[in-house]
């Protein structure tokens, strides 16, 4: 049995495979913000994790993923404000009792030091500092990511 | 009520750096985008360019060459200077918070009243 | 760059009457991503309009707008004499964000 927001987030993520393909992302697109290999957008209004989720795919986008303790830390290096919290496409997965990112990858257990429960209708925002379980209703700031497509031949330093 | 203030010399000569400064009051310039926006006297609006609080930019290429937009977030305020300027650079010169395109908002929702430049020897 | 032209350049109407206001966009302005805004002499543009139909805060039910893709439409139902103004149409979904060349709406 899914929840809602496992519902809402599977449906999402199926009508974005769906689409037909477009050309590599060789740069981001205005008012995105580069980070590395991504292109970022921080909201400045707020919503709760489902609309945030749905919001990024009308822009062509997702959820921000992160892979590991240096991306996490890399893109908590542009929150400028230590109170603000901003949704990422993380949620917890009632059926398989586990946080799962959108694309259907679970947590490495390594990867984040998550504050809060492990528990039905969670979801995990970031701030300039830590990693937050939150009721997914919670009203938030979120990040999107586009990917940028790797050119070959050339080595891009750090953004 | 988020108020834009411009700042900056009326006069400059030709060959010299326009330079303006606009103040940002009662709301925060974080994870909005910051612009200046110019109008010849009696003509049509043109974007010069945008800066984000972190401090990336996005210039018109019509006047890359020549725009530098900066951005102190500990006081509030961006700033526009262009250098090499001419007659063709007389206008109204506006500074704007830009909502961008996340969520329920987009373009320019709150401007400054605009501070006139002329260009003149 | 996006070209928007705005026609026609000169709207003449009387208060009461329905104003229609046209903005091509050379090319697809993406998702929608169109502004209106009015100005009067001596003062800074107002956001009318975002998203190419969303009515920005404080603007009157009166201002709606419509379109996508390449045609754009900015409609007031029935005029205010507060109303004659330069109307301008702005694209912010590709860089450079541009500007129509603007309307002016004037007493017949």
């Known amino acids: 049995q899914k929840s809602s927001i496992e519902k809402c987030s599977v449906d999402i993520q199926q009508s974005r495979n769906k689409t037909t393909e477009r050309p590599g992302l060789l740069n981001c697109p205005i008012y995105w913000q580069q980070l590395r290999e991504k292109c970022l957008l921080f909201s400045h209004t707020v919503n709760p994790w489902n609309n945030s989720l749905a919001d990024c795919s009308t822009k062509e986008s997702s959820l921000l993923l992160i892979r590991d303790k240096d991306e996490l830390i890399h893109t908590q290096n542009l929150i400028r404000d230590k109170a603000i919290l901003f949704w990422i496409g993380l949620n917890f997965s009632l059926s398989e009792k586990n946080w799962k990112w959108i694309n259907g990858s679970f947590l490495n257990s390594n990867d984040l030091e998550i504050r809060g429960d492990a528990k039905e209708n969670s979801c995990i925002s970031i701030s300039q500092t830590s990693v937050y379980s939150e009721y997914c209703s919670t009203e938030i700031r979120w990040i999107c990511q586009k990917e940028l497509t790797p050119v070959r031949n050339k080595v891009y330093p750090d953004s | 009520q988020v108020q834009l203030q411009e700042s900056g010399p009326g006069l400059v000569k030709p060959s010299e750096t326009l330079s303006l400064t606009c103040t940002v009051s009662?709301?925060?310039?974080?994870?909005?985008?910051w612009s200046w926006i110019r109008q010849p006297p009696g003509k049509g609006l043109e974007w010069i360019g945008y800066?984000?609080?972190?401090?990336?930019?996005n210039y018109n290429p019509s006047l890359k060459s020549r725009v530098t937009i900066s951005i102190d977030t500990s006081e509030n305020q961006f700033s526009l200077k262009l250098t090499s300027v001419t007659a063709a650079d007389t206008a109204v010169y506006y500074c704007?918070?830009?909502?961008?395109?996340?969520?329920?908002?987009?373009?320019?929702?709150?401007w400054g009243q605009g501070t006139l430049v002329t260009v003149s020897s | 760059e996006i070209v928007l032209t705005q026609s026609p350049g000169t709207l003449s109407l009387s208060p009461g009457e329905r104003a229609t206001l046209s903005c091509r966009a050379s090319?697809?302005?993406?998702?929608?991503?169109l502004a209106w805004y009015q100005q009067k002499p001596g003062q800074a543009p107002r956001l009318l309009i975002y998203?190419?139909?969303s009515r920005a805060t404080g603007i009157p039910d009166r201002f709606s707008g419509s379109g996508s893709g390449t045609d754009f439409t900015l409609t007031i139902s029935r005029l205010e004499p507060e109303d004659f103004a330069v109307y301008y149409c702005?694209?912010?979904?590709?860089?450079?964000?541009?500007f129509g060349q603007g309307t002016r709406l004037e007493i017949k």
């Open positions: 704007a918070r830009d909502g961008g395109i996340v969520g329920a908002t987009g373009g320019f929702d709150y």
């Open positions: 009662g709301g925060s310039i974080s994870y909005y985008y």
């Open positions: 800066i984000y609080h972190s401090g990336s930019t």
């Open positions: 090319q697809s302005v993406s998702s929608s991503y």
């Open positions: 998203g190419a139909s």
């Open positions: 702005q694209q912010y979904g590709s860089s450079p964000i541009t």
